[in-house]
């Protein structure tokens, strides 16, 4: 039976190692504000590079008519897009609410700004620097305040009011070691709650300029959950950029934008008065619930999601980006009607690297009653005292990934005495240029509890059309004899979504 | 849970110096913001100084700055107040206090006082 099992385990390593490498998000820290345009994405593997192809297919055999829809209706057979055609800009210092159905691919867009998930379609913009809260919470070993502070580098002043916004002060102030009260492995259990609350704290007291907030107020009461949002979501982090996903009608009216998705599209993008002048049937039947904000987020989500299957099926289709902009919006015309494939797929494009690596996570992760997935540290500007960011040790441009996949690779044939040794595993991957950005420590006053480490206003594209062709002579390594290189992170994120 | 205990206290001339101690029992002595308030007969408590739990940040009232530093020794589960260039009108007890809160002057936000030590300038 330990055979099978450990035949078992072997053939899942050897399934991830083969699998493409996972690759981090540029970043470029003179980008104030976010954007998705044109954004389509799948959650199943290959789906990404079918489209292309199917794409690219479609477009070298069109039928007689000319018609070019042929590929998109066949299309749906092979699978469903999480995200269809997903558009929002929210410029710096706004909250957008997500709202939808359940299952409409709220946290799939989180996924999407992190880089967990690639786009088959479309272009993303925003700093890279992100802060995400997962609505499932989770603890490490070690104290309060180390699960708090989490790596970052400790800021009294900061650390105080995180903790007070997030409503710690009267938890903490009962424990006779306060804040250095350990959790987990040997310490104290907290209850869901507390256990919420210090998860968001970890989140917002990381210095980021965009926080994706994944419904993160869960097991709090209605009115706790009413005084973390004003006093940390609306007031501490007034100047910084946030997405929260919410099923409130409280936390859509005091937004900036809403964005309300259903069954993976847009349903309805714009402010909350938009709403209900170009949905007022929708809208008034959330808020002609009584008390719709008092009841349970299961049963909020519920209500959302038949209200919105009821809509859609009524015909009040989804108000599109191009009708909304129409009707209301006095947006400067960035967002073209011509889809670019902006987000390239790595197997036709080249992609831009950070060299600035990303820590890799803890594996003893305390999961109390839950399977509950591992925050992943997005700290893609390590922290230092100075706030420099902080250039890796080795040589990321040197052949070490290489050695340490060929390590693996030969571990994995020791493991299984396997008879595909000469197996090729290797890709052929397009060049890629790496840059560093170091971000000058600014120096602001202590009004902004993010101020020691505020980065320069600074805009990346995380993607422009590039000519492959046109590159290839400049940009040329010989991929053909480095073998598929699986980083940690890669590691930690397959382990998370595979999780059984 | 924590106990304040004032000392230094006494008689001195208007212009001369006196340093108050306050010491605390309990653990996690940093964890609380320390505050110095003073209380004159007949008059409000009202606030000298504060100090953070890691002594990173200081606050004083108007009426004290420049002649008074407040200071802590987490170590040793002290917090200090220098008070130099004393006046008449500096004459009251001096008492201690301990906060959860961050960060006030208010004295309605401290959990914890002690029992106070006179401070007397003559002039």
């Known amino acids: 039976q330990t055979w099978y099992d450990s035949l078992g385990a072997i053939n899942k390593i050897q399934d991830f190692l083969q699998k493409q490498e996972y690759k981090t998000l540029e970043y470029n820290l003179t980008t104030t504000e976010v954007v998705m345009e044109n954004v389509t994405a799948f959650w199943e593997e290959g789906f990404g590079e079918l489209f292309e192809k199917a794409k690219q297919n479609n477009n070298n055999r069109k039928t007689s008519n000319g018609d070019d829809s042929l590929f998109f209706s066949n299309f749906s057979l092979l699978g469903t897009p999480v995200l269809k055609d997903i558009n929002f800009k929210i410029e710096r210092g706004q909250l957008l609410a997500v709202a939808g159905s359940t299952g409409a691919g709220k946290t799939s867009l989180l996924m999407v700004i992190m880089g967990e998930l690639e786009p088959s379609e479309g272009k993303i913009k925003h700093s890279g620097r992100i802060s995400f809260c997962s609505q499932f919470s989770w603890i490490m070993p070690g104290t309060i305040k180390e699960n708090i502070i989490f790596g970052v580098s400790y800021d009294e002043y900061r650390y105080r009011s995180v903790i007070k916004a997030c409503q710690l002060e009267e938890d903490i102030s009962k424990f006779a070691e306060k804040d250095n009260i350990v959790l987990g492995e040997g310490g104290i259990t907290l209850s869901g709650g507390q256990r919420a609350r210090i998860s968001l704290a970890r989140a917002v007291y990381k210095d980021a300029d965009l926080y994706l907030l994944d419904s993160p107020f869960g097991y709090l009461d209605v009115l706790t959950e009413k005084e973390i949002f004003e006093s940390c979501v609306c007031k501490l982090m007034a100047n910084k950029t946030r997405i929260l996903v919410t099923s409130k009608m409280e936390h859509l009216k005091k937004a900036d934008k809403i964005l309300i998705l259903h069954e993976g599209s847009s349903y309805f993008y714009g402010t909350f008065s938009e709403l209900q002048n170009l949905q007022p049937d929708f809208s008034s039947k959330l808020m002609g619930c009584d008390s719709f904000d008092q009841f349970s987020a299961e049963r909020r989500n519920s209500i959302l999601t038949e209200t919105l299957h009821r809509f859609s099926l009524e015909g009040d289709a989804p108000v599109s980006w191009t009708e909304t902009k129409k009707q209301s919006f006095k947006q400067t015309g960035e967002f073209g009607e011509k889809r670019k494939n902006s987000i390239l797929n790595p197997i036709n494009s080249i992609r831009k690297f950070s060299i600035v690596q990303k820590t890799p996570l803890q594996m003893n992760g305390i999961e109390e009653d839950s399977d509950e997935p591992l925050e992943r540290r997005l700290s893609l500007v390590p922290d230092s005292e100075q706030g420099e960011a902080i250039l890796p040790r080795i040589s990321v441009i040197s052949t070490g990934p290489t050695l340490q996949a060929r390590r693996r690779q030969s571990v994995l044939n020791l493991m299984t005495h396997s008879v595909n040794q000469g197996q090729n595993i290797h890709r052929k991957t397009t060049a890629s240029t790496r840059k560093v950005s170091l971000a000058p420590q600014a120096n602001l006053t202590e009004l902004d509890i993010y101020s020691r480490r505020l980065s320069q206003e600074t805009g990346l594209e995380i993607s422009e059309e590039i000519n492959e062709e046109d590159l290839k002579e400049c940009f040329f390594d010989d991929m053909e004899s480095i073998p598929a290189v699986t980083t940690w992170n890669t590691y930690l994120r397959y382990i998370t979504v595979h999780k059984s | 849970q924590v106990q304040l205990q004032e000392s230094g206290g006494g008689l001195v001339q208007a212009g001369g110096s006196l340093r108050l101690s306050c010491t605390a029992s309990?653990?996690?002595?940093?964890?609380?913001?320390m505050g110095w308030f003073r209380q004159a007969p007949g008059k409000e408590r009202e606030f000298v100084a504060t100090?953070?739990?890691?002594?990173?940040?200081?606050d004083y009232a108007d009426s004290v700055k420049g002649r008074f530093t407040i200071s802590r020794d987490n170590a040793k589960n002290t917090v200090y107040l220098q008070m130099n260039s004393l006046k008449p009108e500096d004459t009251a007890v001096y008492y201690c206090a301990a906060s959860s809160t961050y960060y006030y002057t208010d004295p309605e936000k401290y959990d914890y006082w002690g029992q106070g030590t006179q401070v007397t300038v003559s002039s």
């Open positions: 100090v953070s739990g890691n002594g990173s940040r200081r």
């Open positions: 309990g653990r996690a002595f940093s964890w609380y913001v």
